[in-house]
């Protein structure tokens, strides 16, 4: 029996050098969210604890910003940021809910096709 549902931004794309907001939303449950962990594949990016607030992993401090809300903002995107991201909600009394987002970082269209738009 699964009571809650996680809605995510799903599959998203963004341009290299830009930023993107990763968002998850837990609905259909009255459970209390005690902590949300954000992971990139097999790396912990950030933790938002209901009592202690945000902690960003040191290796991502320069490029990851907390929020908005329980979401996460990735900045200065590189092609290496392409991949799976997981929001992991720990709740009381239900347990743990996990959402998945796939991010594809594309080469900047301006950089790629810049010559086409040059004014003679």
């Amino acid at each position: 029996m699964m009571t809650g549902t996680i809605e995510t931004t799903g599959n998203i794309s963004a341009e290299k050098g830009g930023s993107i907001i990763l968002q998850c939303h837990l609905s259909s449950t009255t459970a209390q969210v005690t902590q949300v962990n954000w992971e990139q594949q097999d790396q912990l990016l950030a933790i938002c604890n209901a009592d202690l607030g945000w902690h960003i992993s040191p290796s991502f401090k320069d490029r990851v910003a907390p929020g908005p809300g329980l979401g996460l903002t990735l900045q200065s995107l590189t092609v290496n940021d392409t991949g799976e991201y997981f929001c992991i909600y720990h709740t009381y009394p239900d347990g743990t809910y996990t959402g998945r987002i796939f991010l594809e970082v594309l080469e900047s269209s301006v950089a790629e096709h810049g010559a086409r738009f040059q004014i003679p």
Partner: nanobody, 127 residues
Framework: QVQLVESGGGSVQAGGSLRLSCVAS????????RGWFRQAPGKEREGVAT???????????TYADSVRGRFTISQDNAKNTVYLQMNNLKPEDSGIYYC?????????????????WGQGTQVTVSS
């Protein structure tokens, strides 16, 4: 094929302790949802404790209200083993204890539906 084998059950006086173990084979995912359930005679099987872990370092344990503060679920990743440490046992904790694993990690909690089950180990607490 996932296989779960429990051990550690037995008889104990009220107030005593037991530690159950569950060795898993064939369950090698980067995200895992495992749990302990129990069934007393004439009653439905109920969730006791669950553990969500990921290779990214997330470790979230969840407990039924009836055991919170007395039972602790933990793991030894290297041994593919999950444990249930049971302290201050009460006669109402008696029953067959089952280890379980869930394929999907979209939800991991005592009320989740689990896919794989062990054969169970008997715990008897006398007053």
């Amino acid at each position: 094929q996932v296989q779960l084998v429990e051990s550690g059950g037995g008889s104990v006086q009220a107030g005593g302790s037991l530690r159950l173990s569950c060795v898993a084979s064939g369950y090698t995912y980067s995200r895992k949802c495992r749990g302990w359930f129990r069934q007393a005679p004439g009653k439905e099987r109920e969730g006791v404790a669950t553990l969500y872990t990921s290779s990214g370092g997330t470790y979230f344990d969840t407990y039924a209200d009836s055991v919170r503060g007395r039972f602790t679920i933990s793991q030894d990743n290297a041994k593919n083993t999950v444990y249930l440490q049971m302290n201050n046992l009460k006669p109402e904790d008696s029953g067959i204890y089952y280890c379980a694993a869930r394929l999907s990690t979209d939800f991991c909690g005592p009320r989740a539906d689990f896919d794989y089950w062990g054969q169970g180990t008997q715990v008897t607490v006398s007053s």
